[in-house]
């Protein structure tokens, strides 16, 4: 490590004094200090002498001696005060530039250490510092504004009390630059554009940044467009806007448009697609099957996607029957816009009733005409079952009628004892009827089937049960023969004696 003579950390002299600073190292040494007049430098191998025979306040500062060949990079320093009664400050720079949140050193060096107690920092002309200005002072280095903010870009003066009066330094201009967090922010509107040939169109590309130094351009299918730029400044951001106005669009205007902005941090781009069409269009579609089956009492949402240009002039949901002339309640119809040209229309049908099965149509209109999309809604019902005893062609027959949707399957059971419902332990015999006779099968209605079980003689201590089931559920009816005739047992209902 080099050694400085005199071997003191600070040296205080008067103006006009002779000052000699000698630095000695193992190898060659170099001096570094504030730029100031009247110094002469004399080097002799491993020592270097810095001297002046007429010190001025401008020689105030820290002088550092380094040994370039030292791998540890050691250095020694001495601070020189030249205490001029008329000049308490030596300002090393009149402009300081920092980024926001950095510490800003205002390099006004005190020329007399005795004055340290009475120093303060003010804005020019004795005005107070901006509120919340945190600063500290070092007589060797000056005032440091900590974590400087953009608003603190001001002109400052260092103030010292000398003999009861304030003496100001020359002013120091602080420029606090906004930190550029990245490439400029971009907006390109609209995000998508459709026009009929001959119509007017506008595309706006705008970019903003905390710093004014950035470029923005609009390109069409990789061709940069020459558009006049508008500039603005608000909300502490610089804005540059490019507006493309097309009075009468044609097919060559269609395609991809990109808004591109760049600064020192990099580049941002965003794109949109412009479609030019010959005439108005209106397309209806659904992601759902147009034929819907729902269990009675449950709910259903019917959804239609609409793609249209120009916008819709009208739309509605209509019930086309067959059960009643009721129409969907408007409050159950909902419209959401996915984007400018695509919309979703939803009809909510909560807790469906039998009379609400049928056809529902969504109709929409724009200058391109009318379009409709129709859903067919069939309700599913669990089977309802009834059994009667009759004679067909002279033979005793049990006749089971089952009604439901989808078409029910029928199974006959014979079991011992009198019971409302046969259980496994009681079952004597089971007959499946794979092809019951279909009595009625109309669209949107239940399917009614009939199954016949010919019984030569009714066993009086036994029960005959007709069971029907489909994908929704099952139903059954128990028939109990008694001596006076026969009893039928609908589940959980009264006995019936024909």
């Amino acid at each position: 490590i080099p050694v400085i003579e005199p071997s003191v950390p600070e040296l205080v002299v008067k103006p006009g004094a002779t000052v000699t600073l000698r630095c000695v190292g193992n190898g060659s040494v170099e001096w570094d200090g504030p730029p100031s007049p009247h110094w002469t430098l004399y080097s002799d191998g491993s020592s270097s002498i810095l001297s002046t025979n007429n010190a001025t306040f401008q020689n105030t500062g820290t002088y550092r001696c380094t040994e370039p060949g030292d791998p540890l990079g050691g250095s020694a320093a001495i601070h020189l005060y030249v205490k001029d009664p008329a000049r308490p400050w030596n300002v090393l720079a009149q402009e300081v530039v920092v980024f926001e949140d950095q510490d800003a050193l205002l390099p006004c060096l005190l020329t007399d250490p005795v004055l340290e107690a009475g120093v303060s920092l003010v804005r020019v002309r004795g005005r107070p510092l901006m509120r919340h200005t945190n600063y500290s002072f070092s007589p060797w280095h000056g005032f440091t504004i900590h974590r400087a903010k953009f608003i603190q870009s001001q002109d400052y003066q260092c103030s010292a009390l000398m003999g009861g009066r304030k003496v100001m330094s020359i002013s120091i201009r602080l420029k606090v630059q906004k930190v550029i967090p990245g490439p400029p922010a971009l907006t390109l509107v609209p995000a998508e554009l459709v026009r009929i040939r001959g119509e007017a169109a506008q595309i706006v590309c705008s970019a903003s940044s905390v710093d004014v130094n950035f470029d923005v351009f609009l390109q069409h299918n990789n061709t940069k467009l020459a558009i006049p730029q508008q500039s603005d400044f608000h909300n502490n951001r610089y804005q540059k806007v490019l507006t493309l106005n097309l009075d009468q669009v044609d097919f060559q205007h269609a395609g991809n448009y990109s808004c591109v902005a760049s600064n020192v941090q990099g580049k941002h781009s965003t794109s949109m697609f412009f479609r030019v069409v010959e005439s108005a269009y209106l397309n209806l579609s659904s992601e759902q099957n147009l034929i819907q089956e729902v269990t009675v009492g449950e709910g259903l949402n019917l959804k239609v996607m609409v793609e249209a240009y120009p916008g819709l002039q009208g739309f509605n949901w209509t019930y086309l029957g067959p059960f009643s002339d009721h129409q969907p309640e408007p409050k159950l119809a909902n419209a959401t816009t996915k984007d400018t040209y695509r919309h979703t229309f939803t009809l909510s049908l909560p807790r469906l009733k039998p009379s609400e099965a049928g056809r529902y149509s969504f109709l929409a209109r724009n200058p391109g005409g009318w379009r409709a999309l129709t859903f067919e809604l069939t309700l599913r019902y669990p089977p309802e079952v009834s059994v009667i005893w009759t004679f067909i062609n002279g033979s005793g027959t049990l006749l089971c009628a089952a009604s439901g949707y989808p078409q029910p399957n029928v199974t006959w059971l014979q079991c011992s004892g009198h019971t409302d419902r046969c259980d496994e332990a009681q079952v004597l015999q089971v007959w499946d009827d794979p092809y019951p006779e279909v009595l009625s099968q109309e669209p949107f209605h239940k399917v009614t089937v009939q199954s016949l079980l010919t019984v030569e003689t009714l066993e009086h201590n036994q029960t005959y049960e007709c069971r029907a089931h489909n994908s929704v559920g099952s139903g059954s009816w128990a028939f109990i023969p008694i001596s006076a005739g026969a009893h039928t047992h609908p589940p959980d209902e009264f006995l019936f004696t024909p």
Epitope: S120, V122, R125, R127, P128, L129, M130, R131, H132, T133
Partner: antibody, heavy 120, light 113 residues
Framework: QVQLVQSGAEVKKPGASVKVSCKAS????????ISWVRQAPGQGLEWMGW????????NYAQKLQGRVTMTTDTSTSTAYMELRSLRSDDTAVYYC?????????????WGQGTLVTVSS | DIVMTQSPDSLAVSLGERATINCKSS????????????LAWYQQKPGQPPKLLIY???NRESGVPDRFSGSGSGTDFTLTISSLQAEDVAVYYC?????????FGPGTKVDIK
């Protein structure tokens, strides 16, 4: 609402000192500076100096330098002005005033004033 | 120091009439860096502290009636009361906050004729 409430009237002998207080309420005390302004009987207004309630930084009018000290107590949101070596021409109403929102030395709120009479 | 002078010393104006007060600074209080005039106007009624009316030479303080307006630039400024009301009887001061020490004018007393 913003209020600056000052201490009561004082009668002092020449050569004595006086310390006037100014209690602030209704705003964040440390966000604004306080100036002191005085008005001799029947006379105009004279700015005495300012203090930053944020960091205690002060700037006094040159003619009062060495005789005036301004301080703040942020725990009680109170500003103080002490004037030493009183003379008869220091007889005046002393006002504390809040610096403007802009941090410039004009005043949007004032205390009610404290009459200091210096008389032998 | 910047010396502020006001004219007239006093004036009497009929109710509903216009009152005009002038203020002159010994050097410009226009800051070229922000193009602002560092001048304020205050109203002081007897036994009360001053009340801020105008700042930056022409900006009316919140809650101040719009009959009060300020104008001027550089060294010459004017406070105008467009239609004097009884409650406007007071002493009016201009103040420069351009440079330390921040000085006030001597005041202009406004009365009703």
């Amino acid at each position: 609402q913003v209020q600056l409430v000052q201490s009561g009237a004082e009668v002092k002998k020449p050569g004595a000192s006086v310390k006037v207080s100014c209690k602030a309420s209704g705003y964040t005390f440390t966000s604004y500076g306080i100036s002191w302004v005085r008005q001799a009987p029947g006379q105009g207004l004279e700015w005495m100096g300012w203090i930053s309630a944020y960091n205690g930084n002060t700037n006094y009018a040159q003619k009062l330098q060495g005789r005036v000290t301004m301080t703040t107590d942020t725990s009680t949101s109170t500003a103080y002005m002490e004037l030493r070596s009183l003379r008869s021409d220091d007889t005046a109403v002393y006002y504390c005033a809040r610096e403007s929102w802009f941090g410039e030395v004009f005043f949007d709120y004032w205390g009610q004033g404290t009459l200091v009479t210096v008389s032998s | 120091d910047i010396v502020m002078t006001q004219s007239p010393d006093s004036l009497a104006v009929s109710l509903g009439e216009r009152a005009t007060i002038n203020c002159k600074s010994s050097q410009s209080v226009l800051d070229s860096s922000d193009n602002k005039n560092y001048l304020a106007w205050y109203q002081q009624k007897p036994g009360q502290p001053p009340k801020l009316l105008i700042y930056w030479a022409s900006n009316r303080e919140s809650g101040v009636p719009d009959r009060f307006s300020g104008s001027g630039s550089g060294t010459d400024f004017t406070l105008t009361i467009s239609s004097l009301q009884a409650e406007d009887v007071a002493v009016y001061y201009c103040q420069q906050y351009y440079s330390d020490p921040f000085t006030f004018g001597p005041g202009t007393k406004v009365d009703i004729k």
